[in-house]
């Protein structure tokens, strides 16, 4: 079940996606694609970052926040009804089955006579719950210490995982502290 975001025709749409680099410059590759997240990568890529820069983008799709601080939220400029649908934000942490993928649903409404601002940056009201957990596997899995120590803060599409009693093990797979708001 995707978290739904709304925008009006002619306005800019905002799809949130965040992670917190362990240290400045310790960036993780990220891709955005139109359509639900496939098994790997992003389908129909509209924007991509690597460990240093935004290295691929298409017109109307851009990162308004500071991606070097982990704000990889996507802005779609001057949306039309055709922009409706599922978008995939994939935080591509290196390692086997180690990425974080999030499907966000964008709903475009016809323009009102008096358009109102649609960007909502205060997510506290929408996502009041905070879960912080640290995965600890057996000693053998401490190889994970060799992986980037990344805090991932995701503000979308995690309702299902909150219901998963085995969430802690999923977090162990990423070797990261994850905060879900």
């Amino acid at each position: 079940s995707e978290v739904e975001y709304r925008a009006e025709v002619g306005q800019n749409a905002y799809l949130p996606c965040f992670y917190t680099p362990a240290a400045p410059g310790n960036l993780v590759p990220v891709c955005w694609g139109k359509g639900a997240c496939p098994v790997f990568e992003c389908g129909n890529v509209v924007l991509r970052t690597d460990e240093r820069d935004v290295n691929y983008w298409t017109s109307r799709y851009w990162l308004n926040g500071d991606f070097r601080k982990g704000d990889v939220s996507l802005t779609i400029e001057n949306v039309t009804l055709a922009d409706s649908g599922i978008y995939c934000c994939r935080i591509q942490i290196p390692g086997i089955m180690n990425d974080e993928k999030f499907n966000l649903k964008l709903v475009i409404k016809p323009a009102k006579v008096t358009p109102a601002p649609t960007r909502q940056r205060d997510f506290t009201a929408a996502f009041p719950r905070m879960l912080t957990t640290r995965g600890h596997g057996p000693a053998e899995t401490q190889t994970l210490g060799s992986l980037p120590d990344i805090n991932l803060t995701q503000i979308s599409t995690l309702a299902n995982e909150l219901r998963d009693s085995r969430l802690a093990n999923d977090l162990r797979d990423s070797g990261a502290t994850i905060r879900i708001g």
Epitope: V39, E51, P94, I96, G137, S146, P148, A168, D173
Partner: antibody
Framework: QVQLQQSGGGLVHPGGSLRLSCAAS????????MTWVRQAPGKGLEWVSG????????YYADSVKGRFTISRDNSKNTLYLQMNSLRDEDTAVYYC???????????WGQGTLVTVSS | EIVMTQSPDSLAVSLGERATINCKSS????????????LAWYQQKPGQPPKLLIY???TRESGVPDRFSGSGSGTDFTLTISSLQAEDVAVYYC?????????FGQGTRLEIK
């Protein structure tokens, strides 16, 4: 001592199904990510599928997506690969393997041969 | 996907001599944030499953003889056997685990000259 004991291989007609099993001892399968790798006769290694430590995420190679299903039974400490709509090109020795963290494969099963032929 | 290409396809080396196998990835498997190369080497003998030799491109798995060593970074990697022994006859594979799908090289068959 970590061991992975495989079973379930055999001869099957194209379009048929098989379920491979990988019984683990020396560790619990719900603690580690696990994977299946196959090797066609005389060929190299091809990654097939994987499952995360919790079982919450599953991954498949394009060549098997929609036909194969990876799963596990924690109570039996066993990993499975359900293979449907089998094709001639699925003929291979299938190996299960344990993944260290999110990196390399440190323990492998002995392999089980799947032959798809009419 | 990342394509792994090994060279040579086969190699014949005299006992006690050095054997070198190369592996090239189609894109870098070095993660700059932790300076780790997400690459492993496996040995497979006939009728047996693969055996892990090297991970992180240069870290030897416990129990692996020290005549085996791995080197390289980014896209170019090498497995070296410093003094070939009879029991080293096998097929050797490199594998990247930087990003999915996990991919292996096509293998290098090592024989005794």
């Amino acid at each position: 001592q970590v061991q992975l004991q495989q079973s379930g291989g055999g001869l099957v007609h194209p379009g048929g199904s098989l379920r491979l099993s990988c019984a683990a001892s020396g560790f619990t399968v719900d603690t580690y990510a696990m994977t299946w790798v196959r090797q066609a006769p005389g060929k190299g290694l091809e990654w097939v599928s994987g499952i995360s430590g919790s079982g919450g995420s599953t991954y498949y190679a394009d060549s098997v997506k929609g036909r194969f299903t990876i799963s596990r039974d924690n109570s039996k400490n066993t990993l499975y690969l359900q293979m449907n709509s089998l094709r001639d090109e699925d003929t291979a020795v299938y190996y299960c393997a344990k993944i260290v963290g999110v990196t390399h494969f440190d323990y492998w099963g002995q392999g089980t041969l799947v032959t798809v032929s009419s | 996907e990342i394509v792994m290409t090994q060279s040579p396809d086969s190699l014949a080396v005299s006992l006690g001599e050095r054997a070198t196998i190369n592996c090239k990835s189609s894109q870098s498997v070095l993660y700059r944030s932790n300076n780790k190369n997400y690459l492993a080497w496996y040995q497979q003998k006939p009728g047996q499953p693969p055996k892990l030799l090297i991970y992180w491109a240069s870290t030897r798995e416990s129990g692996v003889p020290d005549r085996f060593s791995g080197s390289g970074s980014g896209t170019d990697f090498t497995l070296t056997i410093s003094s070939l022994q009879a029991e080293d006859v096998a097929v050797y594979y490199c594998q990247q685990y930087y990003s999915g799908p996990i991919t292996f090289g096509q293998g290098t068959r090592l024989e005794i000259k």
